[in-house]
């Protein structure tokens, strides 16, 4: 299984600030896929 | 039956140590973000710790921040969490949760942080 | 971190009375909020989420609206089993919160 998601467990203000200033769903998606693809798939399944 | 046995309360001094213990079962346990939550006497609900699946992400409250650790057994679907260096303002109700891992169809995201299974509570009392 | 303010604090009611309990936030949380029942010596329990969706289980007097900062909890007609204090929680972002929480006792 996999899980994308949008807020975090962990308190990461880097994340927050993007995520406060993406104009579009569709860059929220294209910030999300930036992210699966960097973090390994830290808390997903 | 979805259900959240736990233990490990009681009454310890101000700088010990207490281990809580959260038992999950009628749930595909290691499917799911878990969560301790508190709840001083006679006051509001207060948010402790969130821990993944597969405890890649871990977080903590300001007030706890390396104080407490969360952890979870998958193998044994076991929550715990280990309380070091207890202060009287760490009294509370401890509550474990599951995560709905709620899935927004408009976004095509998950979002943690709804609790849709609660224990039934222990109480952690830090008193000299 | 998204402080969460619930009004009124307690309320008093009759069975069979509407009830509305509103709710706010510091900050823009879109839909990202939860409503939870507790009773006394009880844990929390889940009533509605995502502002207004209802809880599997949860009878239908139960409601919720609102999105942005702004939120309600309605109880279309107040039951015996419904005296209990509520909170809202916000779940948009790290660390969640919930509001002071909203005890409503029988007049």
């Known amino acids: 299984k996999h899980k994308c998601f949008r807020n975090s467990l962990e308190n990461n203000e880097t994340l927050e600030s993007i995520m406060n200033t993406l104009e579009s769903e569709e860059d929220f998606r294209k910030y999300f896929y930036y992210l699966e693809g960097s973090k390994g798939g830290g808390g997903s399944k | 039956e979805v259900q959240l046995v736990q233990s490990g309360g009681g009454l310890v001094q101000p700088g010990r140590s207490l281990r809580l213990s959260c038992a999950a079962s009628g749930f595909t346990f290691d499917d799911y973000a878990m969560h301790w939550v508190r709840q001083a006497p006679g006051k509001g609900l207060e948010w402790v710790s969130g821990i993944s699946w597969n405890s890649g992400s871990i977080g903590y409250a300001d007030s706890v921040k390396g104080r407490f650790t969360s952890s979870r057994d998958n193998a044994k679907n076991s929550l715990y969490l280990q309380m070091n260096s207890l202060r009287a303002e760490d009294t509370a109700l401890y509550y474990c949760?599951?995560?709905?891992?709620?899935?927004?169809?408009?976004?095509?995201?998950?979002?943690?942080?709804?609790?849709?299974?609660w224990g039934q509570g222990t109480t952690v009392t830090v008193s000299s | 971190d998204i402080q969460m303010t619930q009004s009124p604090s307690f309320l008093s009611a009759s069975v069979g009375d509407r009830v509305t309990i509103t709710c706010w936030a510091s900050?823009?949380?879109?839909?990202?909020l939860a409503w939870y029942q507790q009773k006394p010596g009880k844990a929390p329990k889940l009533l509605i989420y995502a502002a207004s969706t209802l809880q599997s289980g949860v009878p239908s007097r139960f409601s919720g609206s609102g999105s942005g900062t702004e939120f309600t909890l309605t109880i279309s007609s107040l039951q015996p089993e419904d005296f209990a204090t509520y909170y809202c929680?916000?779940?948009?972002?790290?660390?969640?919160?919930f509001g002071q929480g909203t005890k409503v006792e029988i007049k």
């Open positions: 929680q916000q779940f948009n972002s790290y660390p969640p919160t």
């Open positions: 900050q823009g949380i879109s839909s990202y």
């Open positions: 949760a599951k995560d709905m891992e709620y899935y927004d169809i408009l976004t095509g995201y998950y979002s943690y942080y709804i609790m849709d299974v």
